[in-house]
């Protein structure tokens, strides 16, 4: 593996920036194999930092093309089954050493991200990634820790509640310590190094090994390459290996069989039938998430990715939490749908970012002819007679408060109430006492009604009430219609937006 300036990129740069000695570390991070790799997501499959890092000291005129790198392997243990498809993130960090640097200073020099497909147990896959002016060459492979086996490192351990409960001769299962190692289920004698089994009494061989117990290297097999050794003393069996045997895909490509032939899924940076062509151009589609690739017409010219909204990173591989910028105003709820940002507005606000304050009560619908009243920075409904509650949706009993005085009987009416007064009383609420001797009423009643028959008087009062009610209802209808017209465009927009949001969230 190597890390240094890419070819044709001018004078090699020192990673130390002429600030004294430094050393390089690699941080390797594995994430589940999705293209929308969220920046905040953890390295769910595992992460590790390189160790045993040599110090690099810049000397005048020295080429930085071959930098001393961390020795040996970077092991990234993963606890669960191997997913096969994953995102590989490799960060190159510089640690600046020396007193004048103010103690150790860390800087991220480069970060490469790529989606990969890789079966466990396969050979080393080689890769090269460029980022800016730096180029990173590396190899990677996935291996199962016994007793997990197979391309997906399937467990062959039996579930138990505690290691102490493991039966005679059985040990705790690694790397699943809450389970116990199962008794051998593979064919007796199956090589623990080069063979594995996914079913009891079978012995499957890792690449490069053959034979009934996977103990024969492929190169020393007595069979031709087109045949597979059979059970002991049976010679060779036909048919020969599948089209993916021997892995025809170069540069870490993974092979899959397709109707008698093979297909290579190449890592980014490689293409061709067998992933044999290297050098990234825009035609290779190096930008994730639909990003626009600019430049990079030939392998020697660098490309730049212009990312869609909600993505960033040199290859648009990082997801941005756009809601963290609090784009929704007036307490609106932000929803980042990936390809769009939506704001769910509080009552009384509208617009793509809840920026419109629906003043003049336009955003408040009072039901049943209620009128909206503003005051003190809030809105409330003044309900028509017979209705109550926050939005005038609750039916109120107008007679509940016993509004008719002096023993008058209350009758609920569509527009409110009517009082039938007891003899000797009159008025909308029977509040006036009528003197039987024709003297003034207390309080005084209109002259023309003093000697009136109470029944005729009541009919007159009802007629007046009806006229007043009709006038009020007509006024309310006009107000409601005009308000509805003003609200229509906002409500229509809100309903459409909520519908879109619902569809997009379900998409």
């Amino acid at each position: 593996h190597s890390f240094g300036p890419g070819p044709g990129l001018g004078t090699p740069r020192s990673p130390c920036n002429a600030r004294g000695p430094c050393r390089l570390f690699f941080r390797v991070c594995l994430k589940p194999g999705v293209s929308q790799e969220a920046t905040e997501s953890l390295c769910a499959l595992g992460a590790a930092l390189s160790t045993s890092v040599p110090v690099y000291t810049e000397h005048p005129g020295e080429s930085a093309a071959a930098l001393p790198l961390p020795d040996g392997l970077v092991r990234v243990p993963f606890r669960d089954a191997w997913p096969g498809t994953f995102s590989l993130v490799i960060e190159t960090w510089r640690e600046q050493l020396g007193e004048h640097a103010g103690g150790p200073a860390w800087n991220l020099l480069a970060r490469v991200v790529g989606r990969r497909r890789l079966a466990a147990g396969g050979p080393w896959a080689r890769d090269v990634q460029r980022t800016g002016t730096w180029e990173l060459h590396f190899s990677y492979r996935a291996r199962c820790e016994p007793p997990a086996v197979g391309a997906a490192c399937a467990r062959l351990c039996r579930s138990r509640s505690a290691p102490s409960r493991c039966g005679p001769g059985l040990r705790p299962c690694t790397p699943f310590p809450d389970e116990c190692e199962a008794p051998s289920v593979c064919r007796p004698g199956c090589s623990p190094e080069h063979g594995y089994c996914e079913e009891p009494d079978e012995c499957r061989c890792l690449e490069g090994w053959t034979g009934p117990l996977c103990t024969v290297p492929v190169s020393t097999s007595s069979c031709l390459n087109s045949r597979v050794p059979g059970p002991a003393s049976t010679g060779c069996l036909l048919p020969g290996p599948g089209p993916c045997d021997g892995n025809p895909c170069a540069n870490g490509g993974s092979c899959s069989e397709t109707s008698g032939s093979f297909e290579c899924a190449c890592p980014r940076g490689f293409y061709g039938l067998r992933c044999e062509v290297s050098g990234v151009t825009c035609a290779d589609g190096p930008c994730f998430n639909g990003g626009l690739c600019v430049g990079g017409e030939d392998p020697d010219s660098a490309y730049v990715c212009h990312c869609p909204p909600g993505f960033q990173g040199s290859n648009c591989e990082k997801r941005v939490d756009r809601c963290s910028l609090q784009p929704c105003q007036n307490g609106g709820l932000c929803l980042d749908l990936g390809h769009a940002l939506r704001c769910r507005c509080r009552a009384g606000f509208a617009g793509p970012r809840c920026e419109h304050d629906l003043d003049d009560c336009a955003g408040r619908a009072c039901a049943n002819g209620g009128t909206c009243v503003e005051g003190g920075g809030s809105r409330r409904c003044s309900c028509a007679l017979g209705f109550g509650g926050r939005d005038c949706r609750e039916r109120a009993d107008p007679c509940a408060s016993r509004p008719c005085a002096h023993g008058g009987r209350c009758y609920a009416h569509f527009s409110g109430l009517v009082c039938a007064c007891a003899p000797g009383y009159m008025g909308v609420r029977c509040e006036f006492a009528v003197r039987p001797d024709g003297a003034d009423a207390v309080p005084a009643a209109p002259r023309g009604l003093r000697q009136a028959d109470p029944q005729r008087f009541l009919a007159g009062v009802i007629a007046v009430i009806v006229v007043v009610v009709i006038a009020i209802v007509a006024g309310i209808v006009v107000l409601v219609i005009s308000r509805k017209k003003r609200m229509a465009k906002y409500e229509k927009a809100e309903i459409k937006e909520m519908g879109e949001m619902h569809r997009e969230l379900n998409a």
């Epitope: 194999g33 999705v34 293209s35 929308q36 498809t85 989606r115 899924a265 190449c266 980014r268 293409y271 035609a283 290779d284 589609g285 190096p286 930008c287 998430n289 639909g290 990003g291 626009l292 690739c293 212009h306 869609p308 909204p309 749908l337 390809h339 769009a340 940002l341 793509p352 970012r353 997009e504 998409a507």
Partner: antibody, heavy 117, light 107 residues
Framework: EVQLVESGGGLVKPGGSLRLSCAAS????????MNWVRQAPEKGLEWVGQ??????????HYAESVKGRFTISREDSKNTVYLQMNSLKTEDTAVYYC????????WGQGTTVTVSS | NIQMTQSPSSLSASVGDRVTITCKAS??????VSWYQQKPGKSPKLLIY???NRYTGVPSRFSGSGSGTDFTLTISSLQPEDFATYYC?????????FGGGTKVEIK
């Protein structure tokens, strides 16, 4: 050289079906989001739909005007994307282009679909 | 959906003229605006992305500007091969939407 070639257009009656194909060459097809964009006669451009990558479970998105009637699919092994159009209406008459990415960087030459009785 | 309103719908100009086409978005689209050129019988070609960045191979006489809701495509010195229809498109909010187009004709 990048090339996108559409085919499958033609004359169809309202209510009928048609399947358009777009064959790509010169690009690593499986790494590209693919779109269909149409242009009615003497009119502007209208995005029709999109299909993403295998790693995105081949997620598809459609314009409201075609939702439920049009279906986009892709066959990476053949470097081809398809547009299956059912219950066609006269207003679907247009030149249909396939195009790549989120920003429609590469375009095909287009194929004409005429819906008429 | 976000509406993109382009003006003028057509214009006549001579070779060497400076031509300006405007595009107005119905709401803030940041700088997520692209411009496309389409010649008769041909497919559109990407000219400008991110409101002001020239795409690969696009001549320097084409420039874009603007952010928010108001955007401009300028051709500093019109060439014979520039007579075409130009479309703006917004990519801030899904689905992407286009302007009605501006036809640039020879005077």
């Amino acid at each position: 050289e990048v090339q996108l070639v559409e085919s499958g257009g033609g004359l169809v009656k309202p209510g009928g079906s048609l399947r358009l194909s777009c064959a790509a060459s010169g690009i690593t097809f499986s790494n590209f989001w693919m779109n269909w964009v149409r242009q009615a006669p003497e009119k502007g451009l209208e995005w029709v739909g999109q299909i993403r990558l295998k790693s995105d479970d081949y997620a598809t998105h459609y314009a409201e005007s075609v939702k439920g009637r049009f279906t986009i699919s892709r066959e990476d092994s053949k470097n081809t994307v398809y547009l299956q159009m059912n219950s066609l209406k006269t207003e679907d008459t247009a030149v249909y282009y396939c195009t790549t990415g989120y920003y429609f960087d590469y375009w095909g030459q287009g194929t004409t679909v005429t819906v008429s009785s | 959906n976000i509406q993109m309103t382009q003006s003028p719908s057509s214009l006549s100009a001579s070779v060497g003229d400076r031509v300006t086409i405007t595009c107005k978005a119905s709401e803030n689209v940041g700088t997520y605006v692209s411009w496309y050129q389409q010649k008769p019988g041909k497919s559109p070609k990407l000219l400008i992305y991110g409101a002001s960045n020239r795409y690969t191979g696009v001549p320097s006489r084409f420039s874009g500007s603007g952010s928010g809701t108001d955007f401009t495509l300028t051709i500093s010195s019109l060439q014979p091969e520039d007579f075409a229809t130009y479309y703006c498109g917004q990519f801030y909010s899904f689905p992407s939407t286009f302007g009605g187009g501006t036809k640039v004709e020879i005077k």
